[in-house]
Interface confidence: low
């Protein structure tokens, strides 16, 4: 054996974001032949041997970070990258806008404008179909998710959440969905690359928008990811996925 | 049963600051969030702001900001909301009320009557 | 902030007639709506929540209805206990505004 046992995958089924007393498995999944699983839930004292947790209702104590490992032999494997199983319709949900309207022209720029009744302050805008958000520290009590020069494959449905950073796997409901109509073009998201461009973040602290843009313009199932924003005066690029900006009280 | 228990009336004068409780009991105090609103007779409910004392977040209404503090302590389970530079225009009843998953406020306290007057 | 305009300020109503309030958002709050009665001397109750789910022990001569900007509060068949100021609520967007009330009066 050269170098430590290759990291499992694990996944929540059907998704990580679970509405609470909503079932949800989390499967641990390494290579044939595994001797043992241990799945654990990361900042508490609780694992098991198993491949799979099944848990029938959601509740708030299980929303958390999880991971897996496996063992073969006397050898442990590399952990998997950590699960963050989140509860959802803990809160009410936020409502979801789009400035200046939800139908806007192939070019053209729009804002989703996530808002919450709640002093919470972060969001996650999620695009129906993509499998991951963009999260967004809060202005006041909303968000803007800026898109700028859209296309054909930012058409779609729009769903945003609110929570808090000091309990971040506890979310809203979601938003009513928001449909965004893009005209004026005949390119469709079929046509799309299938190799994701990097993704910039911007972080603008006198206005508190999350400026996501793209080296070709596009806004894709697979540039669909979460987004760390950093303050602008920080010298440090956006950090990895998961990781929250917090705006200072 | 849900209860919250807020003092009757409070005299204060102009310029001072009063600081308003509100005990909660029957429920778990830190699930829920606890608003405060004002009433003056014949011009309605005004929502203050609230707060969630598990996590101390809080939000205000901006016409509010400048003059009530919202805090908790959750060892005796009381919200308190402190008013500060008192006017005649902030004479009136102030309530505390909670809410919990949804934002409708269910349990309301019986509200404390504030009179600013030298 | 969003302004909820509640209409008749006062009803004069007879024991046993059917009350209609309605409230006007100055835009759209999907349903998120609540009303609720205040008795003199005492702290507003919520009766509705949702602009249509009636809280628990609420007796279900009170309905709500409504969507968008136009919310609509009834009693089917008022009784005397029912005299109290009604408000409506919205807490789609913050600050939370209210209406301004509607007394309702027995005769």
């Known amino acids: 054996q050269s170098g430590p046992l290759p990291k499992p995958s694990l996944q929540a089924l059907p998704s990580s974001l679970v509405p609470l007393e909503k079932p949800v498995t989390l499967r641990c999944q390494g290579p044939p032949g595994v001797d043992l699983y241990r799945l654990e839930k990361l900042s508490s004292s609780r694992y098991q041997d198993q491949a799979v947790l099944f848990i029938p209702a959601m509740k708030r104590s299980l929303a958390g970070r999880y991971r897996c490992s496996y063992q073969n032999g006397s050898l442990w494997s590399l952990p998997s990258d950590q699960l963050e199983l989140v509860a959802t319709g803990v809160f009410a949900k936020p409502s979801l806008s789009a400035q200046p309207g939800p139908a806007v022209s192939s070019g053209g720029d729009v804002t989703l404008q996530c808002q919450t009744r709640y002093g919470f302050d972060q969001f996650a805008l999620y695009k129906e179909g993509d499998p991951a958000p963009y999260k967004n520290p809060e202005r006041w009590y909303r968000a803007s998710f800026p898109i700028i020069t859209v296309t054909a494959a930012h058409s779609g449905t729009y769903r945003c959440y609110s929570f808090s950073s000091r309990d971040p796997y506890l979310w809203s409901a979601p938003s009513d969905p928001l449909e965004l109509v893009v005209t004026g073009t005949s390119v469709t998201p079929s046509r799309l690359p299938t190799e994701p461009p990097s993704p910039v973040a911007e972080f603008s602290e006198a206005t508190a928008e999350l400026t996501v843009s793209f080296t070709n313009e596009v806004f894709t199932t697979e540039t669909s990811r979460s987004i760390t924003a950093s303050p602008k005066e920080s010298d440090s690029p956006a950090g990895p996925a998961r990781q929250y900006y917090t705006k200072g009280n | 049963q849900v209860q919250l228990q807020q003092p009757g009336a409070e005299l204060v004068k102009p310029g001072a600051s009063v600081k308003l409780s509100c005990k909660a009991s029957g429920y778990t105090f830190t699930s829920y969030w606890m608003h405060w609103l004002k009433q003056r007779p014949g011009q309605g409910l005004e929502w203050i702001g609230m707060?969630?004392?598990?996590?101390?977040?809080?939000n205000y209404n901006e016409k509010f900001k400048n003059k009530a503090t919202l805090t908790v302590d959750k060892s005796s389970s009381t919200a308190y909301m402190q008013l500060s530079s008192l006017t005649s225009e902030d004479s009136a009843v102030y309530y505390c009320?909670?809410?919990?998953?949804?934002?409708?406020?269910?349990?309301w306290g019986q509200g404390t009557s504030v009179t600013v007057s030298s | 902030s969003i302004v909820m305009t509640q209409t008749p300020k006062f009803l004069l109503v007879s024991a046993g007639d059917r009350v209609t309030i309605t409230c006007k958002a100055s835009q759209s709050v999907s349903n998120d709506v609540a009303w609720y009665q205040q008795k003199p001397g005492q702290s507003p109750k919520l009766l509705i929540y949702y602009a249509s789910n009636r809280y628990t022990g609420v007796p279900d001569r009170f309905t709500g209805s409504g969507y968008g900007t136009d919310f609509t509060f009834t009693i089917s068949t008022v009784q005397a206990e029912d005299l109290a100021v009604y408000f409506c609520q919205q807490d789609y967007s913050s600050p939370p505004t209210f209406g301004g009330g509607t007394k309702l009066e027995i005769k």
């Open positions: 009320a909670r809410s919990g998953d949804y934002y409708a406020m269910d349990y």
């Open positions: 707060i969630h004392p598990n996590s101390d977040i809080t």
